[in-house]
Interface confidence: medium
């Protein structure tokens, strides 16, 4: 008789998710000489260990300490760049500036970057057919929980100048309910962190507003001098050639017009 | 290594016109956006024009819009400034100089040449 | 039209910290850049991008760029740092703006 099993209104577990994880823990710590040590098959256990024969609903921080324990990483504190819903270009960016580094630049974050998982309570199966969506199931689920612990461990850590990309195409440039929004901004420590400096990424070719004047970014302006922090922000046109000023400032479309 | 020579100054009366080259070495002329800046005796400096790598954009100082014309000949490594209906106010060194177009910053300078407007 | 304005004059003890200001309506959403000029010559680069420095230019000279205000900062001021000082920055338009100009003078 086949077991009943929940159905959850998002996307199942990423297929073949063990596998996946595992590979990319050996092709980070084989491309990365400062994380040699790192055993994988442990890293799969305590990530598997977060989540396996637990209700997918009532995942804690708690659940993934054995994982955050074992992706400890040091990255320069002074060369963090947070994004908020313009993921691709963030990491175009920190591919070409290889002295910055995004959260999905570390051990952790690359190895659950644009994964899906969940698990069964009292099972050791993984549920492939179904995971529990944020907004329609719960908040507490295993992708949500993750995402929010490692996010605020890597908020943590930031000092000196922070930078953070935001899509200046979005109706809310500055969206509280994001990932930066109600994490990552609130767990930026002042006594380490002087600067909090916002990228607005402009969209469209001829967009020469100043989107720095958005009332969501006011209203992270003022989230942030509220802690102490100072706030700067710059317009950033043509994002494709930002990208490509920075990786080749010599490029004739660089050195030329806007 | 990389310079920036002008020439064509010179004394003009009120009305007349000049052209001021730019002569440039050292670097590809014909991938850089090139600017006109000029500073009155004894004053601060002043933006007048910039264009683009391929002439395909020129932008002008209110000041001067209507009367200056910059454009380029990359055959030559030249930058031009043609100067149109002068006054007694665009009296000035004119500096030609090499702008970085993204981020907006002038990195190489010539020596400049003077105007001078007076009858 | 973004107005950039500097103090016309600053100065400063030899070894001292010097700071010049540049005040322009949210300046800092925009990149700032920072020429050194001596009596007869061309101007200089010494910072573009905000805090960038061009080779060849001492690391005592330093910039920051937020809000309203950009600001040049040269630590361990130096008698050959004497100079006229132009910050430069550029309107949503894309025009080229040049503050007024600052004297610095090392006493």
């Known amino acids: 008789v086949p077991r009943w099993r929940q159905q959850w209104s998002g996307p199942g577990t990423t297929k073949r998710f063990p596998e996946t994880v595992l590979a990319r823990c050996v092709k980070y710590t084989e491309i990365h000489p400062e994380m040699r040590h790192v055993d994988c098959q442990s890293v799969w256990d305590a990530f598997k260990g977060a989540f396996i024969s637990k209700h997918p609903c009532n995942i804690t921080e708690e659940d993934y300490q054995p994982l955050m324990k074992l992706g400890t990483q040091t990255v320069p504190c002074n060369k963090i760049l947070l994004w908020s819903r313009i993921k691709d270009l963030a990491h175009q960016f920190t591919q070409v500036q290889r002295d910055m580094f995004t959260l999905e630049d570390t051990l952790l974050g690359y190895l659950a970057d644009d994964l899906t998982w969940c698990g069964e309570f009292n099972t050791s199966k993984i549920n492939y057919q179904s995971c529990p969506d944020w907004r329609k199931d719960c908040s507490n689920n295993p992708v949500s929980v993750f995402w929010k612990t490692v996010s605020r461990r890597f908020a943590e850590a930031a000092c000196d100048v922070v930078h953070v990309m935001l899509n200046g195409s979005r109706s809310k440039i500055f969206d509280k309910n994001s990932t930066f929004g109600s994490v990552e901004v609130h767990n930026l420590q002042p006594e380490k962190v002087q600067t909090l400096e916002a990228w607005v990424i402009h969209g469209g070719r001829e967009d020469s507003r100043d989107l720095c004047q958005d009332p969501t970014i006011k209203e992270l302006e003022s989230i942030i001098s509220k802690r102490n922090i100072q706030f700067s922000c710059k317009n950033i046109y043509r994002p494709d050639k930002f990208l490509q000023c920075v990786k080749n400032p010599e490029d004739s479309s660089c050195t030329s017009e806007i | 290594q990389v310079q920036l020579v002008e020439s064509g100054g010179g004394l003009v009366q009120p009305g007349g016109s000049l052209r001021l080259s730019c002569a440039a070495s050292g670097f590809t002329f014909s991938s850089n956006g090139m600017s006109w800046v000029r500073q009155a005796p004894g004053k601060g400096l002043e933006w007048v024009s910039n264009i683009s790598y391929l002439s395909s954009s020129t932008y002008y100082a209110d000041s001067v819009k209507g009367r200056f014309t910059i454009s380029r000949d990359n055959s030559k490594n030249t930058l031009y400034l043609q100067m149109n209906s002068l006054r007694a106010e665009d009296t000035a060194v004119y500096y030609c100089?090499?702008?970085?177009?993204?981020?907006?910053?002038?990195?190489?300078w010539g020596q400049g040449t003077l105007v001078t407007v007076s009858s | 039209d973004i107005e950039l304005t500097q103090p016309p004059s600053v100065s400063v003890a030899p070894g001292q910290t010097a700071r010049i200001s540049c005040s322009g309506d949210n300046i800092g959403h925009y990149y700032a850049s920072w020429y050194q000029q001596k009596p007869g010559q061309a101007p200089v680069l010494v910072i573009y991008r905000d805090n960038d420095r061009p080779s060849g230019i001492p690391e005592r000279f330093s910039g920051s760029n937020s809000g309203n205000t950009a600001t040049l900062t040269i630590s361990g001021t130096q008698a050959e740092d004497e100079a006229d000082y132009y910050c430069q920055s550029y309107d949503y338009l894309h025009d080229f703006v040049f503050g007024g100009g600052t004297k610095l003078t090392v006493l």
């Open positions: 100089a090499r702008f970085y177009g993204y981020f907006n910053y002038a990195d190489v």
